[in-house]
């Protein structure tokens, strides 16, 4: 029976006389007056079984004591680590001639577990053991013992095991502790692959190549290989696993992501949170669902925040001229978190009696640039009928419209072609400029051509290069624009309304909102 | 078994000589040392010193040099103590002693029954 | 030469009960003393060498321990046998031995 004692995890013991319960049992020759098995205490007041011999006053001394039969558990090179003690001859008096300090060690090997007698010429020789001149004193009981310690390696192994003997010559000397191991390189994980218990190879010198698994939840990337080396070490880890998607490595392992986390490929990378307007239920998600009314366009990416279609245009303005259209408008107010917005025109003949039966323009009208996809705010459609009633739709759409299409994405204006529409406006004047403010008044077109229903003012900081305007619409001749930065240079443009439709925009007065009030009168160019 | 065998009791007269023998058996003679103890009647045990069997090499504690030697005859495994010019002191028992030297320490581990001498005129 | 003194000179005990006797060195002894004990009319035995270690045959009863000049024989619980004298042995610088411990029956 062995009791448990710790050594490295790159040690597999086969034999330690410290570990044994009782007796030892070991074969001496002779059997009296050699090795003599003894029970010693140490520092714990456990028994030691040692044996010793200190056969010092004869001459030719020739002791042997050899161990039980020990399995080589596959291993083709062993080692075997003695402590021992040994008296100083000096120590003993009177013994000069006789008294040796060293021992030697022998090991043969064999199939048969139950080999009776030492029959010495079996045997090879390790070594001869000598006491190093640096020992480690133990407690043994309340005196301090003085310990040697000597390692020793044999090899290669081929029978299913061998025997150890210890050949005494004439030394003082107690074996305290006999230990037999082999190396191994133990069970690790390496870059997600486990590579198993190995037993080293035969030369001190060698290279066992192993072949890694891949852990579970990982795949392949290179072949997972290392090599074993003979001191029970691992060397020169070569390729890998990754984990699967949906697993992310933690402590060596392929762990599924956790609730509100994913990870679409197997790399080597964590799992990352679900992308704005997503979210995951399950464990090991390898992408995460949108939210309601949230879509994934098909090239979109896993990481890619989930996005809805955008809001409708704005400020949609028109402008007939015979039978041609040109339509103006701003971007939505909401892109839907996308970058890839663009504009569809759709058109549409209504009858003059019934403006609610409309049928497609068809494919006589031309659009330009085009009539889909279009990256402008902006489109001129020609060869319409004259005297026809028209309906005008621009849809915003972006990568994820088709998914969930609806009239709150589109803005319409209807119009007649072929009815004059009125002239410009030739002086548009500023009547009073504040800090926040402009005072526009300006005279009616030179031909009205029916009667103006309305007028409307497009403006827009300078800077911004009509990107970004504002329309106000009035039945007076004048207005008051409010909300406006100081010192900041604006562009007016104004332009009459009948029933057929809109007239060209004036010329554009270009105004700089003041520090201090003042009365500026413009004269339909540059006001400063 | 291992044992050692000492000679039954001797009355000397002052003066005389007296030789205890002490003959060894069931172990090598040659392979331990050979210690004399005395106990003087009612005392404790006093060391008087050893001989290499091997050797025949005395080593005499203090107090037992001159009137004391220790001799051997190897082929009969035996140890003597020869004890001259006798004085009344000298009346004790004489134990022979085989001496265990081991690497945790020595001791005298085989006795022999002990010889009785006494002196008195 | 080194001096032994052994104490008490006489241990008065009942079987069953523990026993612990004294040896102390004039100067140190290292681990090198033994114990022995003898029954009237009988010669020595050997029962402790290297000041701890059970010579062969001894009872697990007798335990010692001590190093350098103060040294204890223990008998854990004391049987009839064991009435006898005890004595204490160097071997660090020639031998000598102490005047003896006597236990008795109490």
């Known amino acids: 029976v062995t009791g448990s004692r710790v050594y490295p995890a790159n040690e597999v013991t086969l034999l330690d006389s410290r570990s044994v319960q009782g007796e030892l049992g070991w074969i001496a020759s002779p059997l009296e007056g050699g090795w003599e098995e003894v029970s010693i205490m140490d520092e714990k007041n456990t028994p030691i079984r040692t044996y010793q011999v200190c056969n010092v006053m004869e001459a030719s001394q020739n002791n042997w004591l050899r161990t039980d039969w020990i399995t080589r558990e596959g291993a083709q090179r062993v080692y075997i680590e003695i402590k021992f003690t040994l008296r100083d001859c000096n120590s003993l008096p009177g013994v000069m001639g006789t008294c040796k300090e060293t021992f030697n060690l022998y090991y043969y090997e064999s199939d048969n577990d139950k080999e009776r007698f030492i029959r010495e010429s079996q045997f090879g020789k390790i070594d001869t053991i000598a006491a190093d001149e640096s020992f480690t004193q133990v407690d043994i009981g309340d005196r301090i013992m003085k310990l040697n310690t000597e390692i020793r390696d044999v090899g290669p192994l081929s029978k299913k095991g061998f025997y150890l003997a210890f050949q005494d010559v004439g030394a003082c000397i107690a074996l305290v502790s006999v230990r037999v191991f082999y190396k191994k390189c133990p069970l690790t994980v390496r870059n997600l692959a486990q590579f198993p218990d190995t037993i080293t190879g035969a030369d001190t010198s060698s290279l066992v190549e192993v072949r890694g698994s891949c852990v579970n939840n990982s795949e392949e990337k290179d072949v997972p290989k290392m090599y074993c080396g003979a001191d029970g070490e691992w060397l020169v880890p070569i390729g890998n696993c990754l984990c699967n998607a949906g697993h992310e490595e933690q402590n060596g392992e392929c762990q599924a992501c956790k609730i509100g986390y994913y990870k679409a490929l197997s790399t080597d990378a964590s799992c990352a949170k679900c992308p704005p307007h997503s979210y995951s239920v399950w464990e090991g998600a390898t992408s995460c669902t949108c939210d309601r009314g949230f879509f994934r366009a098909d090239n979109d990416a896993a990481s890619m925040p989930c996005t809805r279609p955008p809001s409708a245009p704005l400020n949609l303005i028109s402008n007939v001229n015979e039978t041609s259209v040109n339509l103006e408008w701003s971007s939505p107010q909401n892109t839907g978190g996308r970058q890839d917005i663009s504009y569809n025109v759709v058109c549409k003949k209504c009858g003059a009696g019934d403006p609610s039966k409309c049928r497609p323009c068809g494919s006589g009208v031309h659009y330009t640039p085009q009539q889909n996809g279009l990256k402008t705010t902006r489109v001129s459609i020609t060869d319409l009928l004259a005297h026809t009633n028209y309906t005008f739709e621009i849809w915003a759409v972006n990568g994820v419209s088709k998914y969930n299409p609806s009239p709150d994405q589109s803005v319409s204006v209807t119009v007649t072609t072929n009815q004059a529409a009125p002239s410009s406006i030739a002086l548009v004047q500023a009547k009073e400029v504040t800090r926040y403010s402009v005072a526009l008044a300006w005279l009616e077109p030179d031909r009205p051509n029916g009667v103006i229903l309305e007028y409307e003012v497009k403006y827009y900081e300078k800077d911004q290069n009509e990107r970004s305007y504002r329309i106000v619409r009035t039945a007076a001749r004048n207005t008051d624009i409010k909300g406006l930065n100081p010192l900041t240079s604006y562009v007016f443009h104004v332009r009459a309304r009948t029933a057929a439709g809109y007239g060209d925009f004036s010329e554009p007065l270009e105004v700089t909102t003041n520090t201090v009030p003042s009365r500026i009168i413009g004269d339909g160019a540059n006001s400063t | 078994q291992v044992q050692l065998l000492q000679s039954g009791a001797e009355v000397k007269k002052p003066g005389a000589s007296v030789k205890v023998p002490c003959k060894a058996s069931?172990?090598?003679?040659?392979?331990?040392?050979m210690s004399w103890v005395r106990q003087a009647p009612g005392q404790g045990l006093e060391w008087m010193g050893w001989i290499n069997t091997n050797t025949g090499n005395p080593t005499y504690a203090q107090g037992f040099t001159g009137r004391f030697v220790f001799s051997l005859d190897t082929s009969v495994s035996t140890a003597y103590l020869q004890i001259s010019s006798l004085k009344a002191e000298d009346t004790a028992v004489y134990y022979c002693a085989r001496v265990r030297l081991t690497v945790y320490g020595d001791g005298m581990d085989v006795w022999g029954q002990g010889t009785l001498v006494t002196v008195s005129s | 030469e080194i001096v032994l003194t052994q104490s008490p000179a006489t241990l008065s005990v009942s079987p069953g009960e523990r026993a612990t006797l004294s040896c102390r060195a004039s100067q140190s002894v290292s681990s090198n003393l033994a114990w022995y004990q003898q029954k009237p009319g009988q010669a020595p035995r050997l029962l402790i060498y290297g000041a701890s270690t059970r010579a062969t045959g001894i009872p697990d009863r007798f335990s010692a321990s001590g190093s350098g000049t103060d040294f204890t024989l223990t008998i854990s619980r004391v049987e009839p046998e064991d009435f006898a004298v005890y004595y204490c042995?160097?071997?660090?610088?020639?031998?000598?031995f102490g005047q003896g411990t006597k236990v008795e029956i109490k």
């Open positions: 069931g172990y090598t003679f040659t392979s331990y040392a």
């Open positions: 042995q160097q071997y660090g610088s020639s031998w000598t």
